[in-house]
């Protein structure tokens, strides 16, 4: 699986999850998030050679097409597969509120 | 929606579904498919600027991060959203068989 366990431990050029730390204020301009100050959102990148973690029959077909037609511009792309939520603390006036934001952290990638 | 209705009628540079015809024998080396000889598999391509058909909170966050940090290499990618099956005819010896292959045709795209 192209997950953090594998990708963060290997120098992998092909499609894999990469570490990306985002600071809410500096990187997004979000002043309303009190805690955490930032988080590892991560991202997916790297080429999708034929059959690498193909998501659907279409991505397998497209990968095969690309292999047999190297001049083709159509190829699968490395995108998030498994995402996890992030729990944040913010304030409504002086009242603290805890919220779980869904699909905030990339845990693994796929070729789609 | 970044679907065939919209994308095939507009000269859209950003993420959109593009027409791609695949000939089973010539492009994939599949001799076992009798009919059709080929089909429009289509593919997704084009940049994913901030908020363009963002798939998840993560892709929205990543798009915003990319906008505010133009030097960043992390950005969402244009990939299939809706896929449709394709019905094919193949032969087992001299006996014809009909099969529906799932997820073969891209109908719309998203930024993921």
């Amino acid at each position: 699986a192209l997950d953090t366990n594998y990708c963060f431990r290997n120098l992998e050029e092909n499609c894999c999850v990469r570490p990306l730390y985002i600071d809410f204020r500096q990187d997004l301009g979000w002043k309303w998030v009190h805690e955490p100050k930032g988080y590892y959102a991560n991202f997916c990148s790297g080429p999708c050679p034929y059959l690498r973690s193909a998501d659907t029959t279409h991505s397998t077909v497209l990968g095969l097409y690309n292999t047999l037609n190297p001049e083709a511009s159509a190829s699968p792309c490395c995108v998030p597969q498994d995402l996890e939520p992030l729990t944040i603390l913010y304030y409504v006036g002086r009242t603290p509120k805890v919220e779980q934001l869904s699909n905030m952290v990339v845990k693994s990638c796929k070729c789609s | 929606a970044l679907d065939t209705n919209y994308c095939f009628r507009n000269l859209e540079e950003n993420c959109c579904v593009r027409p791609l015809y695949i000939d089973f024998r010539q492009d994939l080396g599949w001799k076992w498919v009798h009919e059709p000889k080929g089909y429009y598999a289509n593919f997704c391509s084009g940049p994913c600027p901030y908020l363009r058909s963002a798939d998840t909170t993560h892709s929205t966050v990543l798009g915003l991060y990319n906008t505010l940090n133009p030097e960043a290499s992390a950005s969402p990618c244009c990939v299939p959203q809706d896929l449709e099956p394709l019905t094919i005819l193949y032969y087992v010896g001299r006996t014809p068989k009909v099969e529906q292959l799932s997820n073969m045709v891209v109908k719309s795209c998203k930024c993921s």
Epitope: L51, T57, T60, V61, L64 | L28, G29, G93, R94
Partner: antibody, heavy 120, light 108 residues
Amino acid sequence: QVLLVQSGADVRKPGASVKIFCKASGYTFTSNVISWVRQTPAQGFEWMGGVIPIVDIANYAQRFKGRLVLTADTSTNTAYMELRSLKSADTAVYYCASTLGLVLDAMDYWGQGSLVTVSS
Amino acid sequence: EIQMTQSPSSLSASPGDRVTITCRASQSLGSSYLAWYQQKPGKVPKLLIYGASSRAPGVPSRFSGSGSGTDFTLTISSLEPEDAATYYCQQYADSPITFGQGTKLEIK
């Protein structure tokens, strides 16, 4: 060059199952069809079935239907043959082979064979 | 299922001889659903002929196939010592694929 490498010899008890793998290299696995054939001194060659790897379509010989499962994993270029409810008559050398392209076809490349012995 | 019957079941011939093996199907295969294989002891089968008459890549020209319908032949025009093997025909017109029982060829 094209290579089909199969798992090694196996001994099983009657009623058990056996699963054999067939790993392909040197050609486009997903463009071909993989057939499974077994050979015994008594029955000669028997075709068991075939699988189209990329779409996982399997076709089985009638006599094996219900206890034979053919699958393929395109990510590892590997085909699998699982035979259940083994009988002593299933003792044979099992071969995977790539066909010339059709579901039923001549077979141009063969694995080295996997001897399965069914004995109590 | 289609039965395939080979004849002879065994034969012995000398280097340079012309050898013919026949294969009869229990029902018509048309003109192109037949293959021939060579198998040496302890080895895997090797495809010689497909489509009744097309030689597989790398197969010497002394091997040829012919026939249609129910009757097919494999001919070795000039026997070589390395041709000692068992030869099998195979039909792929209908499921299940079936094979002949084999013809064992010995070199004198």
